[in-house]
């Protein structure tokens, strides 16, 4: 079998809301992946599991199941959203993200994603991780290629 390539493209959008009383930040982060099938047969993308870390702490997890089929020598672009919560021991971030005196409230988040593919009863896992700046001070749409949005997300328990 030839390779299945997974390329993390980046953050497509980040939508933010706050709970002032709990000093909590809620960030819904949509990421974009390119999955390329270099084989001469179709490959099933069984699931995508993702997590987001801030300062070595996992702040959000998500899992997409039964996603799509990628034809021979084809590529698909997939969006997935990870709901994240920055709270408690990270609640000092609330001050920064809501600070009016600065324009861009960039924080550095670690995006981790694992794609599980299947073909002829064989499963393969490919993982990627990348640090990304995300603006926690406003809703932001980042300039990435257009892609289909797969809203079959189930936040992990």
């Amino acid at each position: 079998p030839r390779s299945i390539e997974v390329k993390y493209i980046g953050v497509k959008s980040a939508y933010v809301s706050y709970d002032a009383e709990k000093r909590t930040i809620y960030l819904n982060i949509t990421n974009t992946l390119n999955i390329t099938n270099n084989n001469y047969y179709s490959v099933e993308v069984e699931n995508i599991t993702a997590q987001v870390q801030f300062s070595k702490t996992v702040i959000g997890k998500a899992r997409l199941n039964n996603i799509t089929n990628i034809g021979p020598l084809d590529m698909k672009q997939i969006d997935y959203t990870v709901p994240t919560v920055i709270a408690e021991e990270m609640s000092y971030m609330y001050d920064f993200c809501t600070l009016l005196s600065i324009k861009v409230h960039n924080i550095v988040l670690m995006m981790q994603v694992t794609v599980t593919t299947a073909y002829f009863g064989h499963s393969e896992q490919i993982s990627q991780e990348r640090y990304q700046y995300v603006d926690c001070g406003r809703n932001t749409t980042y300039q990435l290629a257009q892609s289909e949005y797969l809203n079959v997300l189930q936040p992990q328990q």
Epitope: E88, E89, Y92, D95, N106, I107, V108, Y131, Y133
Partner: antibody, heavy 117, light 107 residues
Framework: QVQLQQPGAEFVRPGASVKLSCKAS????????ITWVKQRPGHGLEWIGD????????NYNESFKRKATLTVDTSSSTAYMHLSSQTSEDSAVYFC??????????WGQGTLVTVSA | DIQMTQSPASLSVSVGETVTITCRVS??????LAWYQQKQEKSPQLLVF???NLADGVPSRFSGSGSGTQFSLKINSLQSEDFGTYYC?????????FGSGTKLEIK
């Protein structure tokens, strides 16, 4: 306004231990990490560790793990640092500070610890 | 541990001149850097947080720039009250180490 109050000086005998205090006021004590920093005369700043009063969780610089113990008393909004087995190398000013994202905006005045027989 | 290399170690500058202090970091810390000013017998004072943002009450002649491994603090039109020692500090991972300091003296 936010204030972190520290005693001006502490004298300690070699081999003994000392407990430094940092009393916070003007904000909700349990919401912010308190960090401790050492400065020896003519030297730079060394990060010792920090503690989150809301949970008691703490982080230490490996260099200070056997020397410093960080605690808090939430009822009095006070952070403490216990320094054991004092030697002349421990003679320094010790600052407490309140953590924010990307910096420490609030500092105590510092406590000068003098280790002397 | 992350190493912070600050330069120069000291400099003597006249009032009205412009000064740039640099901080080189041993690994990519993105924007996780602060700058402080410390005067003799005083606590450090936060000048810049998250690499480029001025702290409350800090005059606009101060500015921070850089990201990744190279950072700088610039002071335009130096005033006599700007003397003291300047430190950078990273916030990427514990321990949050400081630079060795730059002593700024007014000519």
């Amino acid at each position: 306004q936010v204030q972190l109050q520290q005693p001006g000086a502490e004298f300690v005998r070699p081999g003994a231990s000392v407990k430094l205090s940092c009393k916070a006021s003007g904000y909700t004590f349990t919401n912010y990490w308190i960090t401790w920093v050492k400065q020896r005369p003519g030297h730079g700043l060394e990060w010792i560790g920090d503690i989150y009063p809301g949970s008691g969780n703490s982080n230490y610089n490996e260099s200070f793990k056997r020397k410093a113990t960080l605690t808090v008393d939430t009822s009095s909004s006070t952070a403490y640092m216990h320094l054991s087995s004092q030697t002349s190398e421990d003679s320094a000013v010790y600052f407490c500070a309140r953590k924010a994202y990307g910096g420490f905006p609030y500092w105590g005045q510092g406590t000068l610890v003098t280790v002397s027989a | 541990d992350i190493q912070m290399t600050q330069s120069p170690a000291s400099l003597s500058v006249s009032v009205g001149e412009t000064v740039t202090i640099t901080c080189r970091v041993s690994e990519n810390i993105y924007n996780n850097l602060a700058w402080y000013q410390q005067k003799q017998e005083k606590s450090p004072q936060l000048l810049v947080f998250a690499a480029t943002n001025l702290a409350d009450g800090v005059p606009s002649r101060f500015s921070g720039s850089g990201s990744g491994t190279q950072f700088s603090l610039k002071i335009n039109s130096l005033q006599s009250e700007d003397f003291g020692t300047y430190y950078c500090q990273h916030f990427w991972d514990t321990p949050f180490t400081f630079g060795s300091g730059t002593k700024l003296e007014i000519k």
